[in-house]
């Protein structure tokens, strides 16, 4: 029971985590314009992995995709790659873990096979979570570096009295979503690995004991008991649950208000 709960919880936590990684990857707010100690602009800039957006104080938002592949910074490409690898591994892990769930019966699958699948999915979730955390952390590091570089020359003279304000970027919501999601996927993976230990059939080799009856000789071999009877699979009492994994197709974003003045 505890094993089933651990496995089920691990699956659910990982599912939430992977959904979060997907959401973070798609989000536009990886970096947002720093409003602190900055001249108050009627334009708010924010950037994602795939496009950059400008929200005007009039309420209009314009987003432009990065239509170049070679012109993008190597770090951004690396972050994209890490996030995609994380999503792919997580998705495969979810697929594997569905079949590995103790509460789902598929044919005459051995517990050892389920244990192996649980371990595989657990490792996949761990790697997926690490990829997401790494990707978000690389991006965050890039932001911090750029932030201090732009702070050093925040106001650059444009000949005479005219000044140009350099836009500084700080951590966007997607970074926090990514960190949390990566962490959840990692935790889910660890839980799956723990559940795997409980699922693995313990190979206890008892010596075959012979009982001699008066009429004829019958040998009971406890070692082969599980395989010979139907009790190992508990087919009578098993409730088969259809894994109804819900996916959220749409993340509704409400316009956040920035009171600039």
């Amino acid at each position: 029971m505890a094993v089933t709960a651990c496995q089920g919880l691990g699956f659910v936590v990982s599912l939430i985590g992977i959904a979060g990684i997907i959401a973070a990857t798609c989000m536009d707010q990886w970096s947002t314009q720093d409003l602190y100690n900055n001249p108050v602009t009627a334009v708010f800039n924010y950037q994602g992995l795939w496009r950059s957006c400008v929200r005007e104080s009039s309420g209009f938002t314009e987003c432009r995709g990065y239509f170049t592949l070679l012109g993008l910074p190597a770090m951004l490409q690396a972050v994209r790659a890490l996030m995609i690898v994380g999503i792919v591994l997580g998705a495969i892990g979810l697929l594997v873990s569905i079949f590995a769930l103790k509460c789902i019966r598929i044919g005459s699958m051995e517990d050892s096979a389920k244990a192996n699948m649980t371990l595989t999915s657990g490792i996949m979730f761990i790697v997926s979570g690490l990829c997401a955390i790494a990707g978000v952390s690389v991006f965050a590091n890039m932001l911090v570096t750029n932030f201090w570089m732009s702070t050093a020359n925040m106001y650059t003279g444009m000949g005479g009295m005219v000044q140009t304000v350099q836009t500084r970027y700080t951590f966007g919501a997607a970074l926090f979503v990514g960190w949390v999601a990566g962490g959840l996927t990692l935790i889910g993976g660890v839980m799956m690995c723990i559940a795997c230990r409980g699922l693995a059939p313990e190979e206890t080799n008892y010596k075959a004991v012979s009982y001699h009856a008066s009429g004829h000789s019958v040998a009971y071999k406890p070692g082969g008991f599980k395989a010979s009877t139907g009790f190992g699979s508990n087919t009578k009492n098993k409730k088969i649950y259809d894994g109804g994994a819900r996916t959220e197709d749409e993340v509704q974003s409400y316009p956040s208000k920035h009171d600039y003045v």
């Epitope: 009627a42 104080s57 140009t164």
Partner: antibody, heavy 118, light 113 residues
């Protein structure tokens, strides 16, 4: 056709209050913020602030905080600006203007003249 | 606050003449996010409200004659009227649409000789 119809001229005594209206038609009223602009004796224009009719959020310039108050009535697609504690400095023509892409004011009301005189 | 300086304050021209109005900002109005200059030009004819002519420094508002052209970047902007018509006699205002509070220039009055 987009139209912004403002209320008629006002003659007020110092210390009094005045409420100017701006009725919008020809577009989705809640889809655009409404700006208010002051023009003293035909000279330059001065931005007072704006209101988002959808959320009711208001933005005021420092100078007009406490002086001007924006409100909206979405059922009648009307924006209002109230000016308190009037002085001769408040004598001007006040415009409402729709806020659009590029932070522009693309449609303007005809203006409401406010005269403060004892 | 951002100071918008327009020059000249008034200009007397003849019909058909090419006119260039200048507008300088105390800070750059270029937004790095979309590489657009948040400068707007308005025309105000006598007894009328202002009318939007140009936004994003060079984008002509629909219905505005092609003789009106906006140019410039950063903090230096110009409005050019290629061939002045009688109906162009008005006051022209430039506006900072990038920094709060939104500020207007003092205006350039265009008069016919």
């Amino acid at each position: 056709e987009v139209q912004l119809q403002q209320s008629g001229p006002e003659l007020e005594k110092p210390g009094a209050s005045v409420k100017i209206s701006c009725k919008a038609s020809g577009y989705s009223f809640t889809g655009y913020k409404m700006n208010w602009v002051k023009q003293s004796n035909g000279e330059s224009l001065e931005w007072i602030g704006n209101i988002d009719p959808y959320y009711g959020d208001t933005t005021y310039t420092q100078k007009f905080k406490g002086k001007a108050t924006f409100t909206v009535d979405t059922s009648s697609s009307t924006a209002y600006m109230q000016l308190k504690s009037l002085t001769s400095e408040d004598s001007a023509v006040y415009f409402c203007a729709r806020y659009n892409r590029g932070n522009t004011m693309d449609y303007w009301g005809q203006g409401t003249s406010v005269t403060v005189s004892s | 606050d951002i100071v918008m300086t327009q020059s000249p304050s008034s200009l007397t021209v003849t019909a058909g003449e090419k006119v260039t109005l200048s507008c300088k900002s105390s800070q750059s109005l270029l937004n790095s996010g979309n590489q657009k200059n948040y400068l707007t030009w308005y025309q105000q004819r006598p007894g009328q409200p202002p009318k939007l002519l140009i936004y994003w420094a060079s984008t002509r508002e629909s219905g505005v004659p092609v003789r009106f052209t906006g140019s410039g970047s950063g903090a230096d902007f110009t409005l050019t009227i290629s061939s002045v018509q009688a109906e162009d006699l008005a006051v022209y205002f430039c506006q900072n649409a990038y920094f709060y509070p939104l500020t207007f220039g003092t205006g350039t009055k265009l008069e016919l000789r």
